[in-house]
Amino acid sequence: LQDLCSNCPAGTFCDNNRSQICSPCPPNSFSSAGGQRTCDICRQCKGVFKTRKECSSTSNAECDCISGYHCLGAECSMCEQDCKQGQELTKKGCKDCCFGTFNDQKRGICRPWTNCSLDGKSVLVNGTKERDVVCGPSPADLSPGASSATPPAPAREPGHSPQ
């Protein structure tokens, strides 16, 4: 019985009631592997989803998210609202990153600025809500005898930036 069904190719299902005949999947359904007993209903890309790849009798539809949203989960199972750079999505919607944190993408959470002093470096460019700080040479490298293409950064607490 199993051997007969294994002859049924993708795009068909094995109909046990019909002497293991391979019936094409009905409209709006598919089987992506051979030997299937049933065809699966095609995924509908509706609402916040849009179709990236149409369904066929041998493969399911693939969805993307409409503009203003991005995919989450395996095979884009969910769409999450985009925020602006410098923001993160909370239960109450998009909120600006707190001081000392940044987000350079339309998705994800705000992350703390890099602490340059942990690497023995100084702040070359201050951080913002949208950008991390840029660390520069360590203060020792900026002694009067050392040649430097850039002037020393103002002496202030690492990561500090007036908002």
């Epitope: 190719p9 795009g11 068909t12 109909d15 019936s23 094409p24 009905p26 009798s57």
Partner: antibody, heavy 114, light 106 residues
Framework: DVQLVESGGDLVQPGGSRKLSCAAS????????MHWVRQAPERGLEWVAY????????YYADTVKGRFIISRDNPKNTLFLQMTSLRSEDTAMYYC???????WGQGTSVTVSS | QIVLTQSPAIMSASPGEKVTITCSAS?????IHWFQQKPGTSPKLWIY???NLASGVPARFSGRGSGTSYSLTISRMEAEDAATYYC?????????FGGGTKLEIK
């Protein structure tokens, strides 16, 4: 836009042969099985043959078995129906349709007459 | 092979009238499809897998049934519904069509 365009129909003598083609566009042809269906003048629809997406499974109506051969060329997005030993009762409009039967061509007319 | 018998073969209905076309199978089938065909055109898939309306089909159409008995219903007939309707069983080879029902507008 999905399109199926049949060609090759003509007037053929009884006992003669004819090869019909169906050019597909607007969808992934190699992902779909395909059918041929025909309709005699002022008559109903008759299913003729089916071929799976990779040509591994083929079925025919009893009325054409042994005389017609369905085949496909996936790289060229084309379906074929080779008809031999044609009879007057094969006179019909021949349609190709994808396996979901949701899209059909406009048909090509085959007339078998002396 | 499975024989599909459609009834009536021909009928006429007034605008607004409810119309039911039946399709009876000689042995049990898993589902049927319905097609609409107008003169000089290719058949159009109208209802698939017994009860699902194809894209663009008005909501006044519905399909139901199981086993050997299936039907297509138009809740309120409109002039544009005048056509020939065919049922098709795709459960068993050879696939078979019903003989068609010609629906005319009064």
């Amino acid at each position: 836009d999905v399109q199926l365009v049949e060609s090759g129909g003509d007037l053929v003598q009884p006992g003669g042969s004819r090869k019909l083609s169906c050019a597909a566009s607007g969808f992934t042809f190699s992902s779909f099985g395909m059918h041929w269906v025909r309709q005699a003048p002022e008559r109903g629809l008759e299913w003729v043959a089916y071929i799976s997406s990779g040509s591994s499974t083929i079925y025919y109506a009893d009325t054409v078995k042994g005389r017609f051969i369905i085949s496909r060329d996936n790289p060229k997005n084309t379906l074929f129906l080779q008809m031999t030993s044609l009879r007057s009762e094969d006179t019909a409009m021949y349609y190709c349709a994808r396996d979901w039967v949701d899209y059909w061509g406009q048909g090509t007319s085959v007339t078998v007459s002396s | 092979q499975i024989v599909l018998t459609q009834s009536p073969a021909i009928m006429s209905a007034s605008p607004g009238e409810k119309v039911t076309i039946t399709c009876s199978a000689s042995s049990s089938v898993n589902y049927i499809h319905w097609f609409q065909q107008k003169p000089g055109t290719s058949p159009k898939l109208w209802i698939y897998s017994t009860s699902n309306l194809a894209s663009g089909v008005p909501a006044r159409f519905s399909g139901r049934g199981s086993g050997t008995s299936y039907s297509l219903t138009i809740s309120r007939m409109e002039a544009e519904d005048a056509a020939t309707y065919y049922c098709l069983q795709g459960s068993s080879y050879p696939w078979t069509f019903g003989g068609g029902t010609k629906l005319e507008i009064k």
